[in-house]
Interface confidence: medium
């Protein structure tokens, strides 16, 4: 029986470890600066890295600019979006800006998009200053179903900071759905 | 066999509980206001509390102003940095400020520092207002290896809010590395 | 013994799953826009949804405007608070605003309230712009005991954005207390 107990313990340790790893999808996606849309209108950002630098993904899928959930669960979602402008890169179309981020969820079954989180600020970026910068951070805990898609919309995409430490979003699974 | 099963369950419960606790390092470090650098330049903040008020640490180490990882894993890192100025404390060197935070990772093996997250804003803190305040929050999910060090750099350290609810950073382990 | 091992594995799988779910309380509460206080003073926000739209709660209690902890543990707490003003809704009492959030913890045993996290900004919302917006995000990792209560205080509650994606707070348990 001692040998059997050891085997039970051993198999359980494997099972527990394996199931724990399988049960914890995550993603941290960083902006792909080679393909940032221009303009000042609100757009969905579709170009993100998932496998270079700080970017990584496991048990989730990145496709067509969207982060796709593969496993039902409660997830913590977050986004950090940085905007910047230097006078050498041209005058702003307007000094009054609305710098915003929207984290949206799309369900394929019901083809509609819903905003989970939003953040941002109106800013007056006067020409009297050579450099302007502003960052937004949002985060929250949401129930996500397999097949649902998370995407990021921003205003003024041409002002995005292209650094991987500046503009990113991500998710990690915290627990199963009861 | 019933007794054996109970023993298996019992030992497993202990093992599961113990391994779960051991597998989840965390830290929440609050600013040590007695030792905030002066000036407006970018500096690394080295004085943090780890064992008073809201500050706490477990299975991580705080040394030489850095949060040291003791256990490989994926961690959620966060920082909240508050800046403030009251006219009674004197005029600002300049009304145009760049209030920034950088969360950096240093690897001892490769003695170089990389910024994981940044946030902040340029601000115009005019003399027309007696009080100014601004907070930055950043957070993200990162792979950290044992021995790696997390530190916080800020601009304008003399403007930091010294309250424990205002200026802090932390980390908690979410999952193992596959 | 093989049957016994299968039974051990089976019962353990149930126990592990059950204990894992029971061990992970969470809440995501969204602002109840029908009952936002007026004025510009600092107030405690007591009206939140816990069971509609993105709002949800499990193994925690929402009562009298406070999120009550039912289970000791280390929790990640977060809040996202959005303020907005449109010129059509009338002039602001003052163009110089202090837009703040305070996440507080109250212990019933020691009837006192302590601020865990704060964030915000002073803003100059000039009449030259028709629309103003600003969001605050805070988050941190805290030890909470059963019976302790989490609440949200803000300045200028009349300026709160009533959308569920804009003004919310939440918590999820990360680990037990050793």
């Amino acid at each position: 029986i001692r040998a059997e107990k050891a085997m039970v313990d051993g198999s359980w340790l494997d099972l527990a470890k394996r199931s724990k790893l399988e049960a914890q999808p995550f993603a941290h996606l960083t902006i792909n600066a080679t393909d940032i849309p221009s303009g000042s209108h609100k757009v969905s950002l579709s170009s993100w890295y998932h496998d270079r630098g700080w970017a990584k993904i496991s048990n989730m899928t990145f496709s067509n600019g969207k982060l796709i959930v593969n496993q039902d669960g409660f997830y913590y979602l977050y986004a950090n979006i940085c905007f910047r402008h230097h006078e050498t890169s041209g005058d702003l179309a307007t000094e009054y800006l609305q710098l915003m981020v929207y984290v949206t969820k799309t369900s394929i079954k019901i083809p509609s998009s819903h905003t989970l989180m939003k953040g941002g600020s109106t800013k007056y970026w006067s020409g009297n200053s050579e450099f302007h910068f502003y960052s937004i951070n949002v985060g929250g805990f949401f129930k996500l179903r397999s097949g649902e898609e998370i995407s990021i919309e921003v205003s003024n995409p041409s002002l995005l900071d292209p650094d991987q430490d500046a503009t990113y979003f991500g998710a990690f699974k915290v627990r199963d759905i009861d | 066999i019933r007794a054996e099963k109970a023993m298996v369950d019992g030992s497993w419960l202990d093992l599961a509980k113990r391994s779960k606790l051991e597998a989840q390092p965390f830290a929440h470090l609050t600013i040590n206001a007695t030792d905030i650098p002066s000036g407006s330049h970018k500096v690394s903040l080295s004085s943090w509390y780890h064992d008073r008020g809201w500050a706490k640490i477990s299975n991580m180490t705080f040394s030489n102003g850095k949060l040291i990882v003791n256990q490989d894993g994926f961690y959620y890192l966060y920082a909240n940095i508050c800046f403030r100025h009251h006219e009674t404390s004197g005029d600002l060197a300049t009304e145009y400020l760049q209030l920034m935070v950088y969360v950096t990772k240093t690897s001892i093996k490769i003695p170089s520092s990389h910024t994981l997250m940044k946030g902040g804003s340029t601000k115009y803190w005019s003399g027309n207002s007696e009080f100014h305040f601004y907070s930055i929050n950043v957070g993200g999910f990162f792979k950290l290896r044992s021995g790696e060090e997390i530190s916080i750099e800020v601009s304008n350290p003399s403007l930091l809010d010294p309250d424990q609810d205002a200026t802090y950073f932390g980390a908690f382990k979410v999952r193992d590395i596959d | 013994i093989r049957a016994e091992k299968a039974m051990v594995d089976g019962s353990w799988l149930d126990l592990a799953k059950r204990s894992k779910l029971e061990a992970q309380p969470f809440a995501h509460l969204t602002i109840n826009a029908t009952d936002i206080p007026s004025g510009s003073h600092k107030v405690s926000l007591s009206s939140w949804y816990h069971d509609r739209g993105w709002a949800k709660i499990s193994n925690m209690t929402f009562s009298n405007g406070k999120l009550i902890v039912n289970q000791d543990g280390f929790y990640y707490l977060y809040a996202n608070i959005c303020f907005r003003h449109h010129e059509t809704s009338g002039d602001l009492a003052t163009e110089y605003l202090q837009l703040m959030v305070y996440v507080t913890k109250t212990s019933i045993k020691i009837p006192s309230s302590h601020t865990l996290m704060k964030g915000g900004s002073t803003k100059y919302w000039s009449g030259n712009s028709e629309f103003h917006f600003y969001s605050i995000n805070v988050g941190g990792f805290f030890k909470l005991r059963s019976g302790e209560e989490i609440s949200i205080e803000v300045s200028n509650p009349s300026l709160l954005d009533p959308d569920q994606d804009a003004t919310y707070f939440g918590a999820f348990k990360v680990r037990d207390i050793d």
């Epitope: 006078e87 050498t88 890169s89 041209g90 005058d91 006067s126 020409g127 009297n128 200053s129 | - | -």
Partner: nanobody, 122 residues
């Protein structure tokens, strides 16, 4: 109608100085980045110096340390003080007001003057 009128050009010996001036009418120069460009016959028009709204100054490498750009928003003028002139500074100098885009890119500028000739003899 927007008009930018340059003046102050002429013939000068190497090592000498000139001061170019640009008077703006029909636009408020204080709301624009104001710059100087120059062009040799048969060559592309190239950036010389700029002063954005912030009051900072930007210079092309060949003129840095010798030329100084300044603006007087009250008078709606932008000047270029040119010292230690060299024969290779010979060109037609144009005043320009930027609409949008990079300071250094001539395509960013919506309004141009007719130009003033600067000749530096050795």
């Amino acid at each position: 109608e927007v008009q930018l009128v340059e003046s102050g050009g002429g013939l000068v010996q190497a090592g000498g100085s000139l001061r170019l001036s640009c008077a703006a009418s029909g636009l408020t120069s204080s709301r624009y980045t104001m710059s100087w460009f120059r062009q040799d016959p048969g060559k592309e028009r190239e950036f010389v110096a700029a002063v954005p709204l912030s009051g900072n100054t930007y210079y092309a490498d060949p003129v840095r340390g010798r030329f100084t750009i300044s603006r007087d928003n009250a008078k709606n003028t932008v000047d270029l003080q040119m010292n230690s002139l060299k024969p290779e500074d010979t060109a037609v100098y144009y005043c320009a007001a930027r609409a949008s885009g990079s300071i250094f890119n001539r395509g960013s500028y919506a309004y141009w003057g007719q130009g003033t000739q600067v000749t530096v003899s050795s």
